[in-house]
Interface confidence: low
Amino acid sequence: KKVVLGKKGDTVELTCTASQKKSIQFHWKNSNQIKILGNQGSFLTKGPSKLNDRADSRRSLWDQGNFPLIIKNLKIEDSDTYICEVEDQKEEVQLLVFGLTANSDTHLLQGQSLTLTLESPPGSSPSVQCRSPRGKNIQGGKTLSVSQLELQDSGTWTCTVLQNQKKVEFKIDIVVLAFQKASSIVYKKEGEQVEFSFPLAFTVEKLTGSGELWWQAERASSSKSWITFDLKNKEVSVKRVTQDPKLQMGKKLPLHLTLPQALPQYAGSGNLTLALEAKTGKLHQEVNLVVMRATQLQKNLTCEVWGPTSPKLMLSLKLENKEAKVSKREKAVWVLNPEAGMWQCLLSDSGQVLLESNIKVLPTWSTPVQP
């Protein structure tokens, strides 16, 4: 008996071939011997089966001795043995129809779980293997679960159902809702304008929700909400903003925040959360601000940084075009009685300069100038 696998909602064509290459009488029946369709001369006739409105054949092939049964919009319950009767012969074809669905929304938040459920006909024992867009393979029976979805899981999941050495392939499009970056860090000199950007890693027609930026300043004992906003069809509107600092927010995506000035009291870490309409859970992106200040007080030239710096970062003070006078893995360095000239304060990571501030030290009778 020939086995054919079909996909729920798809169309399948079951073949039936006569030895005579001409149009002769045929009919298709199901396992209960109920007629599905057949011919009367050149006319297609349909029987009383439940397939009535979904069954068809190809009259253009009858003259070649081919009498296919086409079943449209397949249902799991169409799984059956179909019998083609032609030339006093019977050809049997077993049709097994499978369905694979994501049992939740196909738009899922990063970190959430995806469950794929296989619908299969009674008596079948299929195995399923799915391949994620990043090439990860998962195997299972009637259900497959993937926990902790990552951004790279967005895209087309290809699932292969295997039964009786035959296979059928399903493609399911999954969107992992997340920010492009989990975390970012901005390095600024004191007084400079700060731009924070929060690009999303997905595109949808309509995006509605609300968000908030909580900020934990390094100098503060607790975090505070800097801004809350609404998102309606990709348009951003500010609901509430603190007076200090007075953040500005772009009206369009990607989410964009401007801090007018980088000041030591603002240095720290923020967490932007975005709650999307009809979704449980929130998207998160961490953002960090490091602020540098170089000052000269009396005979002491000081360079300081505030904010979340890693212990491997190096802070240096050097006279322009000369070797570093002082270089430490600390958040403040200083030089006593600095020579006159242009001094550079450098924050670097493995030789790569992340932040630089220049200060001009005048001969001792003058006051310093900060360019």
């Epitope: 867009p133 790279q152 967005s154 087309t156 499009d173 997905f202 595109t203 949808v204």
Partner: antibody, heavy 120, light 107 residues
Amino acid sequence: QVQLQESGPGLVKPSETLSLTCTVSGGSISGFYWSWIRQPAGKGLEWIGRIYTSENTNYNPSLKSRVTMSVDTSKNQFSLKLSSVTAADTAVYYCARDREGYYYYGMDVWGQGTTVTVSS
Amino acid sequence: DIQMTQSPSSLSASVGDRVTITCQASQDISNYLNWYQQKPGKAPKLLIYAASNLETGVPSRFSGSGSGTDFTFTISSLQPEDIATYYCQQYDSLPITFGQGTRLEIK
């Protein structure tokens, strides 16, 4: 924006191994598939394969026995090695980024290509 | 492997003409098809993804349609800068395969 630059010897002797490197600048190499494609002079495009991580590669079956791809995230580079080359491997070799996601996919960023000639 | 057959292999048209290129897959590939433009001495450039979606920054005179095995790429009004070779590419299954290309010239 992201830019790709192929590098490697322009001339390789028959039976030797062709080695090319693609350097990614202006963006991270992580989180994307990266493909190699070649094009003999005056001919069409042939996909060689792609890499996501060192453990996750897909090669064209017609070249699989001779191809090795690797990625170095610390240098933002990925590489192609093609062994036992013949004159038929003479082509312009391109590296490209495979963009995958919801309802889209395409090689959206390409290097400018590097010509490799196999000759003794 | 899925074979991709483009036609015609070359065509000549005048500025302002509507130009159509077809691509046929050897099996059903749903809408998993892209179109690329390649100018002489340059790398290919993605124009259309998923059969009918215009890549960001690509002029709207370019369009794509089709599903299953038969696909069409259209330039609604040919411009001099459109002189190039155009390739279709399937990604329904690995290995990724390209059509043989259609060379477009100005009359």
